[in-house]
Amino acid sequence: HKCDITLQEIIKTLNSLTEQKTLCTELTVTDIFAASKNTTEKETFCRAATVLRQFYSHHEKDTRCLGATAQQFHRHKQLIRFLKRLDRNLWGLAGLNSCPVKEANQSTLENFLERLKTIMREKYSKCSS
């Protein structure tokens, strides 16, 4: 079966986001990947989207991320814009209304995105072969 166009869009967005780092990609998020043994693929996507939504809702107007200059502000807007796109596409792939995120473990957003990219690339390699 063919790879979903949404999956390709997610990988493309993750490739862009992991090309460079900002001050705020070093902030922490819930690490849903730490213990995801008994989690279905759809649940993983749903929970990843939830984590991203929590992050950008909390940090969209965070002065530490917005910075002091127009250039820093533009950078942060870029980050939020790409995270929102990722969130939207992950919800589309998950097809679930909601999912709990209860883990205590934390990782940086940067590491979270790298891990998510690995998972998405693995999924892509399976569906394209």
Partner: antibody, heavy 118, light 107 residues
Framework: EVQLVESGGGLVQPGGSLRLSCAAS????????MHWVRQAPGKGLEWVVW????????TYADDFKGRFTISLDNSKNTAYLQMNSLRAEDTAVYYC???????????WGQGTLVTVSS | EIVLTQSPATLSLSPGERATLSCKAS??????AAWYQQKPGQAPRLLIY???HRYTGIPARFSGSGSGTDFTLTISSLEPEDFAVYYC?????????FGQGTKVEIK
């Protein structure tokens, strides 16, 4: 593969005008800002302008305000640099460069040479 | 505008040697400094952004450090292909500005 291709350079007389084009491919054009940077023969790099490709908002270096205008055609994935009232000191290779997602300029065109001379 | 001053103007070294390039800003740019490499007849290439982060595909022998007004690009062991001109650049605030460049030449 990301590619930026400049065109429109050439010989122009002092006081004349020229429009440079930068055709982008291999990525979503409106996701990344676009810059123009120039380099006079044997000299260093000089930043000219950048444009937010999502909003169309430009930011110019002071020396170029009024004489140079950056614009976009998002349907063609192309950025333009309109240069008016050209002077001999505007002679340079003009590069377009994609702004990195957050920092710097991560992809550059091959450059196009503008020569202002009578 | 923020002025960036690079030193030395020219660095004469042999392959295998360590190169240390300096860039000083006229006011603080926090960590918003980048480094580019340019070879004759070619466009510049992004090496380092955000002071110390290597861009995708850049070899580990290139490293950046510093903060505020003082920044350094280090090439731990020069390869033949590293002989080029290096520019620092700030993207802390508009107008973005470049240093005048440091030429790394073969001794």
């Amino acid at each position: 593969e990301v590619q930026l291709v400049e065109s429109g350079g050439g010989l122009v007389q002092p006081g004349g005008s020229l429009r440079l084009s930068c055709a982008a491919s291999g990525y979503t054009f409106t996701d990344y800002s676009m810059h123009w940077v120039r380099q006079a023969p044997g000299k260093g790099l000089e930043w000219v302008v950048w444009i937010n490709t999502e909003t169309g908002e430009p930011t110019y270096a002071d020396d170029f305000k009024g004489r140079f205008t950056i614009s976009l055609d998002n349907s063609k994935n192309t950025a333009y640099l309109q240069m008016n009232s050209l002077r001999a000191e505007d002679t340079a290779v003009y590069y377009c460069a994609r702004g990195g997602i957050f920092y710097g300029m991560d992809y550059w065109g091959q450059g196009t040479l503008v020569t202002v001379s009578s | 505008e923020i002025v960036l001053t690079q030193s030395p103007a020219t660095l004469s070294l042999s392959p295998g040697e360590r190169a240390t390039l300096s860039c000083k800003a006229s006011q603080s740019v926090i960590n918003d400094a980048a480094w580019y490499q340019q070879k004759p007849g070619q466009a510049p290439r992004l090496l380092i952004y955000y002071t110390s982060h290597r861009y995708t595909g850049i070899p580990a022998r290139f490293s950046g450090s510093g903060s505020g007004t003082d920044f350094t690009l280090t090439i731990s062991s020069l390869e033949p292909e590293d002989f080029a001109v290096y520019y620092c650049q700030q993207d802390y605030t508009s107008p973005w500005t470049f240093g005048q460049g440091t030429k790394v030449e073969i001794k």
